[in-house]
Interface confidence: low
């Protein structure tokens, strides 16, 4: 009796452990049986066709390769799809930047919040803040709140984010604190 390929599934061949950015990765499209035996494979990610081999190989995987993959196996009787298989790529914090709210120019006496933004998997677990002299500041959360902000707070700041894979740092961002009209009037 002839039938379409059965029990199609995606299997990770390598690495044996979790996938880190830069790893060589191989996925295999497996099926239990097919009659007739002549088959064709299709690989797809998020709706985009990638290849027609039984294996899908990445020489050096990147975070952009993460996503939902599936394969189909075809024979002359029909086409059978695997369940979607999620490829997760772990990587150190990257694209770090310091954003400032309400902006990078704030009047003294108000509040300013500096946020260390990043892209990381797993998410950043530890933040370190530094000033323009590369002095570490006693803040270890994603947000650094200055209230009331003083003119002496003017300067450049940067942050470092750390996760289980590694660490990354942001470029410098400059905060300018200007005198209030009251202070100027007293002078």
């Amino acid at each position: 009796v002839q039938y379409a390929p059965r029990d199609v599934r995606v299997r990770k061949i390598k690495p044996l452990s979790e996938i880190h950015s830069g790893n060589s990765v191989s996925l295999q499209c497996d099926f239990s049986s097919s009659h007739p035996k002549e088959v064709q494979f299709f690989w797809e990610k998020n709706g985009r066709l990638l290849g027609k081999e039984s294996q899908l190989n990445f020489d050096s995987i990147s975070p952009e390769d993460a996503g939902s993959y599936s394969c189909w196996v075809n024979n002359s009787i029909g086409q059978t799809a695997s369940k979607a298989w999620t490829l997760e790529v772990l990587y150190a914090p990257r694209r770090l930047r310091v954003s400032m709210s309400p902006g990078d120019q704030v009047m003294e006496g108000k509040s300013a919040t500096l946020t260390c933004e990043s892209d990381a998997n797993p998410p950043v677990s530890h933040y370190t803040w530094f000033d323009w002299n590369n002095q570490s500041l006693p803040y270890h959360s994603q947000k650094l709140r200055l209230e009331p902000v003083k003119v002496q707070h003017s300067g450049a700041y940067w942050c470092q984010g750390t996760n289980s894979v590694g660490k990354g740092r942001s470029p410098l961002s400059t905060l300018t604190v200007y005198y209030s009209p009251e202070t100027i009037g007293r002078r």
Partner: nanobody, 118 residues
């Protein structure tokens, strides 16, 4: 080279029906497996139904379409059909025709849009 053109998509109310067609031209004598796939916005492309070219024309359906969808073909005119009944909003997607030839090359159509309103 096989060229595929889908038609029959459109806007339909929930519970309604549509009949999609996929017309093949080119070296159609070599086609041995035909299927309909669909892709909803932001979702994975998925197999809806497939049919073999052999005399039996063995058919296969995804669970989502069993009992509601019917795949068929007219070998003389090289047309593949998908009859869709009792449509649901979750059937909203672009529907694509895939044909696989005896040398196991594959050809896709450009798709036809199906929108099911509630």
């Amino acid at each position: 080279q096989v060229q595929l053109v889908e038609s029959g998509g459109g806007l339909v109310q929930a519970g309604g029906s549509l009949r999609l067609s996929c017309s093949a031209s080119g070296i159609t004598s070599s086609i041995n497996s035909m299927g309909w796939h669909r892709q909803a916005p932001g979702k994975q492309r998925e197999l809806v139904a497939s049919i073999g070219r052999g005399g039996s024309g063995s058919t296969k359906y995804a669970d989502s379409g069993k009992g509601r969808f019917l795949i068929s073909r007219d070998n003389n005119k090289n047309i593949l059909f998908l009859e869709m009944n009792s449509l649901k909003p979750e059937d909203t997607a672009d529907y694509y025709c895939l044909e696989v030839t005896t040398d196991l090359s594959s050809y896709w159509g450009r798709g036809t849009q199906v929108t099911v309103s509630s």
